[in-house]
């Protein structure tokens, strides 16, 4: 065959799709690759091409379009399944052709069984709801396209295994989930099962996702400095061990970048020829505000590092700040014995 | 404990109408969604309806649907079934069940029955 | 509608006896599958729900598997008191519907 362009095994595209439930895949061709649509490709007399390959095995097959009441069928650019069976796991390759011109992407397809409680391996997408922040909407996702605007599917919404019937401050509106005054306590795995019918069978759509209730931006701050602070002073002798830890305190902020730097005498530590590392960790409270320290080390600091200026600078959406650490050298103690004789005019 | 009780069971024509209750107790009412199961004699069960938590959603089987409605009130804690237009094979014992708020959706608690006979 | 089918409608079987009653749907219903046991002049009871989970308070010996059309009941050793009407029920649609019932009756 001749030569055609291939994308090889989209692996961005991880698809998880339940066991016996319906699933439509849309070629990634249209979606990633190309600049052209379905439509645009049809109408010049190109032609979608379906392959497959089963897990665990290197063979290429066609898929088999004449199942029983049309289990996989494919429309337009979509793959349709109706509904999947654990055994349709494995790569999938679609192909688009004409006698000059071709091109083709595989992806993977996994299909995730699930219990009774919709426990499974699938990977949850995650829905981020602020704190006490008025009334915030989840909506099942991904069932556009299942049937069509004059079926009448029904919603029911869970929470972990149960339905949601009467919850405080949670109410099931048919698509979509309203959280009242979203609360630490509404944290959880949320599903919407959809029912429908379609030509005398029925069909679920199950979707799970994750809720995290985090801090909510009318309580957002610019970066607290905790430490260093004018509390602390760090008196060092040379040749003993400096640290000085940054300590930083960040609001959650919806996809903003937290950044904690030191300098040393206005100069990035990478810049500056002393021997200093930094080690930073970093941890989370229930609402995502970020605590970050990062601590400064000098195994062996001179008397030149004690003059130096170390500041901690810190930066988020919300603003930049900096706070320099008091470092200075200790001053020896008097060496008492000779102190005295000399007081005492010994020779 | 989680009690179901049903009543308004009785003799009735072909044509004419019936209300069935069924009071609960000892669990929050409200919380639940409730179905009514008819069984004729000695024959076996038959789903007939349900009716969701807040009555926002009812459905019923073919056999019962526009003559048939399921209802609640949910401050008096009783659930109920208008039979309107009763046919003779409508004569059956007609459980109230409760459904658990999980996905598989059991009945976890029945009442006792009311008999219905539907008879010239 | 989703038709439920159960197998056999009627069985006789001896105390300490293991039997199986199976129920069959017309299309794949995943695990929304729970069986009841109703005797005489007594409201159903429920035994096992999503296909396999025990409910509280049922003795062991009662046992659900399968998954999508295809489902069994079994007692591992039947006890006098078990001898009664079982009833698998799906409520993978909205509108319910039960497996015509198996009586089970001492030999």
């Known amino acids: 065959s001749e030569r055609c362009d291939d994308w090889g095994l989209d692996t961005m595209r991880q698809i998880q799709v339940f066991e016996d439930e319906p699933a439509r895949i849309k070629c990634p061709l249209f979606e990633h690759f190309l600049k052209f649509n379905y439509s645009t490709a049809h109408s010049a007399g190109l032609t979608l091409i379906w392959y497959w390959t089963r897990q665990d095995r290197d063979l290429e097959e066609p898929i088999n379009f004449r199942l029983p009441e049309n289990r996989i069928s494919k429309e337009k650019d979509v793959l349709w399944f109706r509904p999947t069976l654990l055994n349709d796991t494995g790569n999938y390759t679609c192909m688009l052709r004409n006698t000059t011109y071709c091109s083709k992407v595989a992806f993977p397809l996994e299909v995730v069984q699930k219990d009774s409680c919709f426990n499974s391996p699938m990977k949850l997408p995650v829905h981020k709801l602020y704190i006490e922040y008025g009334i915030q909407r989840i909506t099942c996702p991904n069932v556009d396209g299942y049937f069509p605007s004059s079926v009448k599917p029904t919603i029911t919404w869970y929470m972990g295994c149960y339905k949601i019937q009467n919850f405080n401050n949670v109410i099931p509106e048919g698509m979509n989930l309203s959280f009242l005054i979203a609360l630490i306590s509404n944290n959880g795995n949320y599903t919407c099962v959809v029912t429908y019918p379609e030509n005398g069978r029925t069909f679920h759509l199950t979707r799970t996702l994750t809720v995290k209730v985090v801090g909510s931006p009318k309580n957002a701050v610019p970066p607290v400095i905790h430490s260093p602070n004018d509390h602390v002073v760090y008196e060092k002798e040379p040749g003993e061990e400096l640290l000085i830890p940054c300590t930083v305190y960040f609001s959650f902020l919806m996809d903003s970048r937290n950044e904690v730097w030191w300098t040393i005498d206005g100069k990035k530590p990478d810049d500056i020829t002393i021997d200093v590392t930094i080690n930073e960790s970093i941890s989370h409270s229930r609402t995502e505000d970020e605590t970050r320290t990062q601590i400064l080390s000098i195994k062996k600091v001179t008397s030149e590092d004690l003059k130096r200026s170390y500041v901690c600078h810190a930066r988020s959406a919300k603003g930049e700040v900096a706070k320099a650490a008091k470092v200075k050298q200790k001053v020896p103690a008097p060496r008492y014995t000779v102190e005295l004789a000399c007081g005492f005019g010994a020779t | 404990q989680v009690q179901l009780v049903e009543s308004g069971g009785g003799v009735v024509q072909p044509g004419r109408s019936l209300r069935l209750s069924c009071a609960a107790s000892?669990?929050?009412?409200?919380?639940?969604?409730i179905h009514w199961v008819r069984q004729a004699p000695g024959k076996g069960l038959e789903w007939v309806a349900v009716?969701?938590?807040?009555?926002?959603?009812?459905f019923y089987a073919d056999s019962v649907k526009g003559r048939f409605t399921i209802s609640r009130d949910n401050s008096k804690n009783t659930l109920y079934l208008q039979m309107n237009s009763l046919r003779v094979e409508d004569t059956a014992v007609y459980y109230c069940?409760?459904?658990?708020?999980?996905?598989?959706?059991?009945?976890?608690?029945w009442g006792q029955g009311t008999l219905v006979t539907v008879s010239s | 509608d989703i038709q439920m089918t159960q197998s056999p409608s009627s069985l006789s079987a001896s105390v300490g006896d293991r039997v199986a009653i199976t129920c069959r749907a017309n299309?794949?219903?995943?695990?929304?599958l729970n069986w009841y046991q109703q005797k005489p002049g007594k409201a159903p009871k429920l035994l096992i729900y999503g296909a396999s989970s025990l409910q509280n308070g049922v003795p062991s010996r009662f046992s659900g598997s399968g998954s999508r059309t295809d489902f069994t009941l079994t007692i591992s050793s039947l006890q006098p008191e078990d001898f009664a009407t079982y009833y698998c029920?799906?409520?993978?649609?909205?509108?319910?519907?039960f497996g015509q019932g198996t009586r089970l009756e001492i030999k």
């Open positions: 009716i969701w938590y807040d009555g926002s959603n009812k």
């Open positions: 029920q799906q409520s993978y649609s909205t509108e319910i519907t």
């Open positions: 000892g669990f929050t009412f409200r919380n639940y969604g």
């Open positions: 069940a409760r459904e658990e708020g999980i996905a598989v959706a059991p009945f976890d608690y």
């Open positions: 299309q794949s219903i995943a695990s929304y």
